[in-house]
């Protein structure tokens, strides 16, 4: 009896610890898209509607906060497109990018962890023009660092929110 | 504030050429498209080209490929419409007109004509 | 080749009236859609566009509505001034305008 007892705490414990584990799914807000045909900053995203989801993590001022020291998966997906209905591509050649970037508050600094992308030719004879870029990647992170995303050209981001998102799981505490 | 001054009235004979301006002012020139836009008597307007004003890059309609060219001095914040081989039916007022979204916005240039210039009357006539 | 096409071609209307003009495309350009005003020997005038979205400087008595491939353009109170021909626009095509007049 007592093992059991103690089995039924050991699954409580996991249990517990595993609804703990952080993780942030966060999608891109489309009314809310900044202008410009450099790189930028994306800095609004949904964190509780739809697919977006988010805890033990903060979405604060355009940053996905890590709140717990540990190892985490990062990912980002972004997908480009433009529709003749829309206008014409004022340019034909295109760099369609994302960087996932690292700041740390407690020594300020800022580090690129991922980049993804191309160079694209993107005729004026086509109708429609799609592309997608998907990163991710296994970080160190500690307490109070800030994820942000940039990209470039962000007039021609897909809004949806199965197209325009990022997000990140603990996978393991630092020993 | 913005404005777009074009070159004056202008007649010509059927076969010959005509070269339109389009001085702008009170905006960052090479940050905006331009476009041409003309409208011959008792039709509808009728859109001709644009250019992006910052890297020259042009696009025309299917009707005007091979007899329209779209230039623009950045220095001279001017825009030029040349039409060549006139014939009667280009007789109508050609008007140019700044695309609303400028390419610090955006590289779309989204067809929202949000400044024009005040037209200038060409007559094609023998 | 998308075709815009406007009704009416022309209307007359009473100082005060409530003015509707249709435009339709031929097939579904979400809400790319402007508005343009034109007066004989003046530079046309952008009124609305995306649809619904009023051009700065522009009175409030106008006003924009419709999606997919049917748009109206509302004067809710014409006035004198409102005398002129309106052209409705997606991208590189017009509509074949529609004259105001008063009666």
């Known amino acids: 009896e007592k093992a059991m007892v103690d089995g039924s705490w050991l699954d409580l414990a996991k249990r517990s610890k595993l609804e703990a584990q952080p993780f942030a799914h966060l999608t891109i807000n489309a009314t809310d898209i900044p202008s410009g045909s450099h790189k930028v900053s994306l800095s609004s995203w949904y964190h509780d509607r739809g697919w977006a989801k988010i805890s033990n993590m903060t979405f604060s001022n355009g940053k996905l906060i890590v709140n717990q020291d540990g190892f985490y998966y990062l990912y980002a997906n972004i997908c480009f497109r433009h529709h003749e209905t829309s206008g014409d591509l004022a340019t034909e050649y295109l760099q369609l990018m994302v960087y996932v970037t690292k700041t740390s508050i407690k020594i300020p600094s800022s580090h690129t962890l991922m980049k993804g992308g191309s160079t694209k030719y993107w005729s004026g004879n086509s109708e429609f023009h799609f592309y997608s870029i998907n990163v991710g990647g296994f970080f160190k992170l500690r307490s109070g660092e800030e994820i942000s995303i940039e990209v470039s050209n962000p007039s021609l981001l897909d809004p949806d929110q199965d197209a325009t998102y990022f997000g990140a799981f603990k996978v393991r505490d630092i020993d | 504030q913005v404005q777009l001054v074009q070159s004056g009235a202008e007649v010509r004979k059927p076969g010959a050429s005509v070269k339109v301006s389009c001085k702008a002012s009170g905006y960052d020139f090479s940050n905006y498209a331009i476009h041409w836009v003309r409208q011959a008597p008792g039709q509808r307007l009728e859109w001709m080209g644009w250019?992006?004003?910052?890297?020259?890059?042009?696009k025309f309609s299917q009707k005007f490929q091979g007899r329209i060219t779209v230039t623009r001095d950045t220095a001279a914040s001017t825009a030029y419409m040349e039409l060549r081989s006139l014939r009667s039916e280009d007789t109508a007022v050609y008007y140019c007109a700044r695309d609303s979204s400028g390419m610090v916005r955006g590289i779309i240039i989204a067809y929202y004509f949000d400044y024009w210039g005040q037209g200038t009357l060409v007559t094609v006539s023998s | 080749e998308i075709v815009m096409t406007q009704s009416p071609s022309s209307l007359s209307a009473s100082v005060g009236d409530r003015v509707t003009i249709t435009c339709r495309a031929s097939q579904s350009i979400s809400r790319y859609l402007n508005w343009y005003q034109l007066k004989p020997g003046k530079a046309p005038r952008l009124l609305i566009y995306g649809a619904s979205s009023l051009q700065s400087g522009v009175p409030s008595r106008f006003s924009g509505s419709g999606s997919g491939a049917e748009f109206t353009l509302t004067i809710s109170s014409l006035q004198p001034e409102d005398i002129a021909t309106y052209y409705c626009?997606?991208?590189?095509?017009f509509g074949q305008g529609t004259k105001v007049e008063i009666k």
């Open positions: 626009q997606h991208t590189r095509a």
């Open positions: 250019i992006n004003a910052g890297n020259g890059n042009t």
